[in-house]
């Protein structure tokens, strides 16, 4: 039969209620009375789903009695006031404690009335990202690493590049019963072309506003790669002096530049200033090959130039002269 | 301490209408909702209905709809329950009883239909 | 409605000894569930709420257990003063049912 009034009472509760392990949660339960409905409320109960009995109770009489005294609290129901506020905090959140709860008012004229809370369980990973230094292997190895640990539910990490690449992600259980630790590998060809980027690692957990973005700055180690620059084919008799450098990009930094010519060492006219070369005015012609040996960790490499130094158009040209 | 004092035993024709009073004291009697139970000779409990004293808002057994009728008088803290139409068959023990669940009882009032 | 079925209308029991009294709903009621005692002459006494709770001054050999549709009221160590018929009742919908009642009888 229908009650007295417009409408019926409502119990009101969010569907789903996040919690972080170790910390307290409140699974708000509120009855909504319309405004021309009577009710009064004899009970607050809730109970969990599978379990036998209540976990905790409020009776206007009786007043609060729970499962475990030590881990719950009614927030806002008190003897001798309106039960309307059924709202429950839980103390020392577990990982058993995710679950369905359902919470209960009984109220007299219209009987029980009810709805069911999801309580999830969470815990927000600490998240770090390193680089793994590599040298050029020819084959496809981990290049970063990204760990989210100590999570619930895991992470899911993923990798942001315009180098490529291809992620290789594991899981396994974190310090803490329930959580997972995820650890992924950014892996890809080792170049000299990728030392010195970035890759970005991207971590998104349900405790998080927004993903973390993790930067890694990839480091491969190689040997030197070698040019002379500062040759324009164009040097004269009679021209200014002249520098060549020897350029050289390697991981780890070069050690050591070595000039020298096909031929064995420097003429008198090439005088080294470790990278750079410097060529002095010549009075007749050259035709040489200088070659700059570049040393680093991994080994040496080199480069050669051939230099000529003609007879030919007057001084306005840039180049070798005396002064 | 919460008491409810049940009006006396009763002996009523058949057909007529007989009025029983639960007076109730050691509380605020728009707390508590007030219900009334029947219990025939030896047998079990039968909800008849429930008053809540605040609004006066009732909630009756179906099978006692038109038999029962449920009042309070807030000034004197009491609740009354009118019982209509009486047959040998409404002959019982009448309780009122405060709060859901039923935590606390009158003594029960004797009801006789006889001619 | 709700029909709550006390299957044992009578239990025997010796002093000292455990018993449990059974109760069926015939739908789902949570835990809205009380447990009364009615001595010979007396008005019943309310024992147990929520299922398994006990009201203040209710001895602790009293002890209810139960949610959906199955309840138990166990009484252990019994004492002689605990003979009594015991009724469980729901209160989670209207109208309010009770059970048909156990008489506990001590040997």
């Known amino acids: 039969w229908p009650p007295p009034g417009t409408g019926d009472v409502v119990v009101q509760a969010p569907t789903q209620v996040p919690g972080f392990l170790g910390d307290s949660v409140t699974l708000p339960c509120y009855l909504q009375v319309p405004n021309m409905e009577v009710t009064h409320v004899s009970q607050l109960t809730w109970a969990r789903h599978g379990e036998s009995g209540s976990m905790a109770v409020f009776h206007q009489t009786q007043g609060p009695s729970y499962s475990e005294s030590k881990r719950l609290e009614f927030v806002a129901a008190r003897l001798g006031a309106e039960l309307r506020n059924a709202s429950l905090r839980m103390f020392g959140l577990r990982v058993e404690d995710e679950g369905n709860y359902t919470c209960l008012f009984v109220t007299f004229p219209q009987g029980s009335r009810s709805v069911d809370i999801w309580l999830r369980v969470l815990a927000k990973p600490q998240n770090t990202a390193e680089v793994q230094k590599v040298q050029l292997t020819g084959e496809p190895v981990p290049m970063a690493r990204c760990v989210s640990t100590g999570g619930r539910p895991p992470a899911q990490i993923t990798w942001h590049s315009d180098l490529g690449g291809m992620p290789n992600t594991s899981q396994v259980p974190g310090f803490l019963s329930g959580t997972v630790t995820v650890t992924s590998l950014w892996i890809l060809v080792p170049s000299s072309q990728v030392d010195g980027k970035n890759v970005t690692c991207k971590v998104e957990h349900e405790s998080f506003e927004k993903p973390q973005l993790l930067t890694v700055n990839l480091t491969v180690y190689y040997p030197p790669e070698v040019s002379i620059s500062g040759y324009d084919n164009n040097w004269y008799l009679g021209q200014n002096e002249a520098t060549l450098t020897c350029d050289a990009r390697s991981n780890p930094e070069p050690t050591g530049y070595n000039w020298s010519t096909t031929m064995g060492p420097l003429p008198p006219f090439a005088v080294a200033q470790g990278a750079q070369l410097l060529i002095r005015p010549v009075d007749k012609p050259i035709n040489t090959t200088l070659i700059c040996n570049v040393t680093n960790a991994l080994g040496a490499r080199q480069a050669e130039l051939t230099v000529q130094v003609k007879e030919g158009p007057p001084s306005e040209h840039s180049g070798i002269s005396r002064n | 301490e919460v008491k409810l004092q049940e009006s006396g035993p009763e002996l009523v024709k058949p057909g007529a209408s007989v009025k029983i009073s639960c007076k109730t004291s050691g509380y605020t009697f728009t707390e508590y909702t007030m219900h009334w139970v029947r219990q025939s000779h030896g047998e079990s409990l039968e909800w008849i209905g429930g008053i809540d004293p605040n609004n006066g808002g009732t909630n009756y057994n179906q099978n006692f709809k038109g038999k029962a009728t449920l009042t309070v008088d807030k000034s004197s803290s009491t609740a009354y329950m009118e019982l209509r139409s009486l047959t040998s068959e409404d002959s019982a023990v009448y309780y009122c009883?405060?709060?859901?669940?039923?935590?606390?009882w009158g003594q029960g009032t004797s009801v006789t239909v006889s001619s | 409605d709700i029909v709550m079925t006390q299957s044992q209308k009578f239990m025997s029991t010796s002093v000292g000894d455990r018993v449990s009294v059974t109760c069926k709903a015939s739908?789902?009621?949570?835990?809205?569930v009380a447990w009364y005692q009615q001595k010979p002459g007396q008005s019943p006494k309310a024992l147990i709420y929520?299922?398994?709770y006990r009201y203040r001054g209710v001895p602790d050999r009293f002890t209810g257990s139960g949610s959906g549709t199955d309840f138990t009221l166990t009484i252990s160590n019994v004492q002689s003063e605990d003979l009594a018929d015991y009724f469980c009742q729901q209160y989670n919908s209207y109208p309010l049912a009770f059970g048909s009642g156990t008489k506990l009888e001590i040997k």
């Open positions: 929520s299922a398994s």
């Open positions: 009883a405060g709060v859901i669940p039923l935590e606390y």
């Open positions: 739908q789902n009621v949570y835990t809205n």
